[in-house]
C-alpha cells in the first residue's frame, strides 16, 4: 500500500506548506480532533477535510493558500482499515470535538496524519517493504 | 527499473539563471513527487523543494523561495528546477530524487553547475 | 527550522570493525529519520527509513534505531565497500539533512 503511505505523507508536507501561511487563514476556531480513539481516525481525518479552512485573501499568498487547502481535501487511497472503519457508528461526530484556531487545527491535523502513518506501517511486516 | 536521467554539466555567471531537468523512466511519472537536493563541493546535502508532478505543485525550502522554480512536463515525464539570480556559493551539484512513501527512494546522477565570472 | 547533527565528522575503521554514527535533531521528529550513504562522484543512496527499517537490497550488517531526538547507524561488520560518507534527514517537517560522517580506512 505505498500509494496510501507516499499520500498520506503528502498530506503531511501540504500542511507544513500552511503551517507558514497560517498569519493569511482566516482565524476561524474549527473543530480540530485530538488523542482520537483507536478504530476513529478515518472518522477524525474526515472532520478534518470538512473543516472550512479560508484564506483571509490578503497578499500575495492567496493562490498558494487555495490551492494547499484544496489538496487537503482530495479523498486519498482508501486501505482495508480505512474500510472498515466507515462502517463504525461510534465514533463522536465532528461538532463534538473542540474547536481551535487554524495554527492548532493544523497542528492537530499533522498528528492524526502522523498516527495514521504509523499505524499503517505497524500493520506490515518489519523490513519488508520498499521505503 | 526506476531512473532519473539529469541534464549535462553548466557554467553561468553570476547574476544569471540556470535550468537543471531530470527526465525519469520505469514508472508512472505522475505517481510520484519529485525533490530536488544541492551538495556543494565538499559539503553536505541541502533540500531545495519539491514538485507535485500530477499539478505542478509546489513547496520551496524558505532559503531559496523567490530563486527558485520547479516545473514539470508531463508529456516527457521531465522535471526543471531554474535558480535565478545566480553566485558563486550556489556552485554545486544538483540532485532530482523520487519522493517515495518516507524517503527520496531513486536519485538522478546529478548536474554540476558552476558559477564563475 | 529543525537542524540536524551529526557525529562524528569522520571517522578511521578496519574491515570487520562494528562502526556507530550519531545523529541529533534539534527538536523532537518521532521516528521520521531516515540514512543514506554516498559515495566520492555518485548520487546518495537510501540504506534505512523510518529510523529503522532496511530499504530492499541494503545488507542486513546496516541497522538503525533511535527515536525523538537521537539516531544511530550502526555498521555491525564493516565492508570494503562501506567505506563512504552517511547522511541523517529528518522528514518531520519538510526535509533537513545532517551534516555527514565520512567513514575513512584506517
Known amino acids: 500500500q505505498d500509494r496510501h503511505m507516499i499520500r498520506m505523507r503528502q498530506l503531511i508536507d501540504i500542511v507544513d506548506q500552511l503551517k507558514n501561511y497560517v498569519n493569511d487563514l482566516v482565524p476561524e476556531f474549527l473543530p480540530a480532533p485530538e488523542d482520537v480513539e483507536t478504530n476513529c481516525e478515518w472518522s477524525a481525518f474526515s472532520c478534518f477535510q470538512k473543516a472550512q479552512l479560508k484564506s483571509a485573501n490578503t497578499g500575495n499568498n492567496e493562490r498558494i493558500i487555495n490551492v494547499s487547502i484544496k489538496k487537503l481535501k482530495r479523498k486519498p487511497p482508501s486501505t482495508n482499515a480505512g474500510r472498515r472503519q466507515k462502517h463504525r457508528l461510534t465514533c463522536p461526530s465532528c461538532d463534538s470535538y473542540e474547536k481551535k484556531p487554524p495554527k492548532e487545527f493544523l497542528e492537530r491535523f499533522k498528528s492524526l496524519l502522523q498516527k495514521m502513518i504509523h499505524q499503517h506501517l505497524s500493520s506490515r511486516t518489519h523490513g519488508s517493504e520498499d521505503s | 527499473q526506476v531512473q532519473l536521467v539529469q541534464s549535462g554539466a553548466e557554467v553561468k555567471k553570476p547574476g544569471a539563471s540556470v535550468k537543471v531537468s531530470c527526465k525519469a523512466s520505469g514508472y508512472t511519472f505522475t505517481d510520484y513527487w519529485m525533490h530536488w537536493v544541492r551538495q556543494a563541493p565538499g559539503q553536505g546535502l541541502e533540500w531545495m523543494g519539491l514538485?507535485?508532478?500530477?499539478?505542478?505543485?509546489?513547496i520551496y525550502n524558505q532559503k531559496f523561495k523567490g530563486r527558485v522554480t520547479m516545473t514539470r512536463d508531463t508529456s516527457t515525464s521531465t522535471v526543471y528546477m531554474e535558480l535565478s539570480s545566480l553566485r558563486s556559493e550556489d556552485t554545486a551539484v544538483y540532485y532530482c530524487?523520487?519522493?517515495?512513501?518516507?524517503?527520496?527512494?531513486?536519485w538522478g546522477q546529478g548536474t554540476l553547475v558552476t558559477v564563475s565570472s | 527550522d529543525i537542524q540536524m547533527t551529526q557525529s562524528p565528522s569522520s571517522l578511521s575503521a578496519s574491515v570487520g570493525d562494528r562502526v556507530t554514527i550519531t545523529c541529533r535533531a534539534s527538536q523532537d521528529i518521532s521516528n521520521y529519520l531516515n540514512w543514506y550513504q554516498q559515495k566520492p562522484g555518485k548520487a546518495p543512496k537510501l540504506l534505512i527509513y523510518?529510523?529503522?527499517r532496511l530499504h530492499s537490497g541494503v545488507p542486513s550488517r546496516f541497522s538503525g534505531s533511535g527515536s525523538g531526538t537521537d539516531f544511530t547507524l550502526t555498521i555491525s561488520s564493516l565492508q570494503p565497500e562501506d567505506f563512504a560518507t552517511y547522511y541523517c534527514q529528518q522528514f518531520n517537517t519538510l526535509r533537513t539533512f545532517g551534516g555527514g560522517t565520512k567513514v575513512e580506512i584506517k
Open positions: 514538485i507535485d508532478t500530477s499539478d505542478s505543485y509546489t
Open positions: 523510518y529510523t529503522s
Open positions: 530524487a523520487r519522493y517515495g512513501p518516507l524517503a527520496m527512494d531513486y
